[in-house]
């Protein structure tokens, strides 16, 4: 990512900017944006960033609100990079099964699962 | 999902079946399957299930190994359902910002972020 700060710091700064500019961002009272119904956020990154794009196009730019959208675009770049790393490395079945076991274990413990 | 058992129980059973059939599954020593480099599993569901498809096509079917792949296909159906729920509901900016804040908060605490 072409940024001088680590992604974790970028996320922290973005949270702060989001708080700062909340009033400006909610100014458009007619705008409606898709919001996921569940909390398995990583499944919804595409929709979240489409929503950010919609919001950006409807927001008066200038000052640090621009910095907010710049940060969000860098976060998107980071996530796109992570998505690329999902399929780049072809490994043996043994490693795949270890990863699948981990994935299912995480589903079992950390995912928000509706019956 | 057309299954009598809750998804959480389905995942538990699948983990057990994966353990049981490990030896059969690793029989193909030349097969290579993409394995994500990181642990942000939800970003990689597409690749994981493509890998499962590859594995299934290379595995001698019969008995409870069929049950394993059936379960995995039900888990995929569940995840696909969750993905559909990412964009179905159009809400006001306020709700979207709440969700975005939660998403960034989760990135900040629960995601595996490399500097």
């Amino acid at each position: 990512i072409p940024t001088e700060i680590p992604t974790s710091a970028l996320v922290k700064e973005t949270l702060a900017l989001l708080s700062t500019h909340r009033t400006l961002l909610i100014a458009n009272e007619t705008l409606r944006i898709p919001v996921p119904v569940h909390k398995n956020h990583q499944l919804c990154t595409e929709e979240i960033f489409q929503g950010i794009g919609t919001l950006e196009s409807q927001t008066v730019q200038g000052g640090t609100v621009e910095r907010l959208f710049k940060n969000l675009s860098l976060i998107k770049k980071y996530i796109d990079g992570q998505k690329k790393k999902c399929g780049e490395e072809r490994r043996r079945v043994n490693q795949f099964l270890d990863y699948l076991q981990e994935f299912l274990g995480v589903m079992n413990t950390a995912w928000i699962i509706e019956s | 999902i057309p299954t009598e058992i809750p998804t959480s129980a389905l995942v538990k059973e699948t983990l057990a079946l994966l353990s049981t059939h490990r030896t059969l599954l690793i029989a193909n020593e030349t097969l290579r399957i993409p394995v994500p480099v990181h642990k942000n599993h939800q970003l990689c569901t597409e690749e994981i299930f493509q890998g499962i498809g590859t594995l299934e096509s290379q595995t001698v079917q019969g008995g409870t190994v069929e049950r394993l792949f059936k379960n995995l296909s039900l888990i995929k159906k569940y995840i696909d359902g969750q993905k559909k729920k990412c964009g179905e509901e159009r809400r006001r900016v306020n709700q979207f910002l709440d969700y975005l804040q939660e998403f960034l908060g989760v990135m900040n605490t629960a995601w595996i972020i490399e500097s």
């Epitope: 270890d98 981990e102 995480v106 | -």
Partner: antibody, heavy 119, light 107 residues
Framework: QVQLVQSGAEVKKPGASVKVSCKAS????????INWVRQAPGQGLEWIGY????????RYNQKFKGRATLTVDKSTSTAYMELSSLRSEDTAVYYC????????????WGQGTLVTVSS | DIQMTQSPSSLSASVGDRVTITCKAS??????LSWIQQKPGKAPKTLIH???RLIDGVPSRFSGSGSGQDFTLTISSLQPEDFATYYC?????????FGQGTKVEIK
């Protein structure tokens, strides 16, 4: 910075067990597998196994299966390698090493722990 | 298990020399091979991963090449601090296995 700090040297009698610790700092412990490698005096390197702190899953080199046990304590970001039924051939320096990514190269190594097995 | 055969087992060279170490895997390991340097009494240090990718902070005089079964580590111009033992490691399949090492000594 990212560091793996191992416990001090041990002297054990044949038949005894030894437990070596490897304390991780400077990163999120559960994000990376911890591998264990040993090196007998004047010899090469030998992989013992790995543990995934994310789910406590471990995998062993068949040569050590049944004698080596890999565990983690997430609360202290520490990995452990216990070797039982020690024999003189187990005299070696034991290293822990972090996987950069899943089943990836070892990007950080511990300083090593000398275990001497002698009657 | 995958056998890793390294050659030579030792070599003598002078500062400024170009040094080449080879590693042969008993089966195809794709490019899942790393090169590791170890100095006497010190912990190992990984120099190269995935056959040819230099790790951050490692001098560019080190380079790796190869895929499948045959791999090479090259030091383009040997420096005093490069005298050490070098190991290849395959992390393609379990159990991970190392070459027996190549000791690079001063001529």
């Amino acid at each position: 910075q990212v560091q793996l700090v191992q416990s001090g040297a041990e002297v054990k009698k044949p038949g005894a067990s030894v437990k070596v610790s490897c304390k991780a700092s400077g990163y999120t412990f559960t994000n990376h597998h911890i591998n264990w490698v040993r090196q007998a005096p004047g010899q090469g390197l030998e992989w013992i196994g790995y543990i995934n702190p994310y789910n406590d899953y471990s995998r062993y080199n068949q040569k050590f299966k049944g004698r080596a046990t890999l565990t983690v304590d997430k609360s202290t970001s520490t990995a452990y390698m216990e070797l039982s039924s020690l024999r003189s051939e187990d005299t070696a320096v034991y290293y822990c090493a972090r996987d950069y990514g899943n089943f990836w190269y070892f990007d950080v190594w511990g300083q090593g722990t000398l275990v001497t097995v002698s009657s | 298990d995958i056998q890793m055969t390294q050659s030579p087992s030792s070599l003598s060279a002078s500062v400024g020399d170009r040094v080449t170490i080879t590693c042969k895997a008993s089966q195809d390991i794709n490019s899942y091979l790393s090169w590791i340097q170890q100095k006497p009494g010190k912990a190992p240090k990984t120099l190269i991963h995935r056959a040819d990718r230099l790790i951050d902070g490692v001098p560019s005089r080190f380079s790796g090449s190869g895929s499948g079964q045959d791999f090479t580590l090259t030091i383009s111009s040997l420096q005093p601090e490069d005298f050490a033992t070098y190991y290849c490691l395959q992390y393609d399949d379990f159990p991970y296995t190392f070459g027996q090492g190549t000791k690079v000594e001063i001529k």
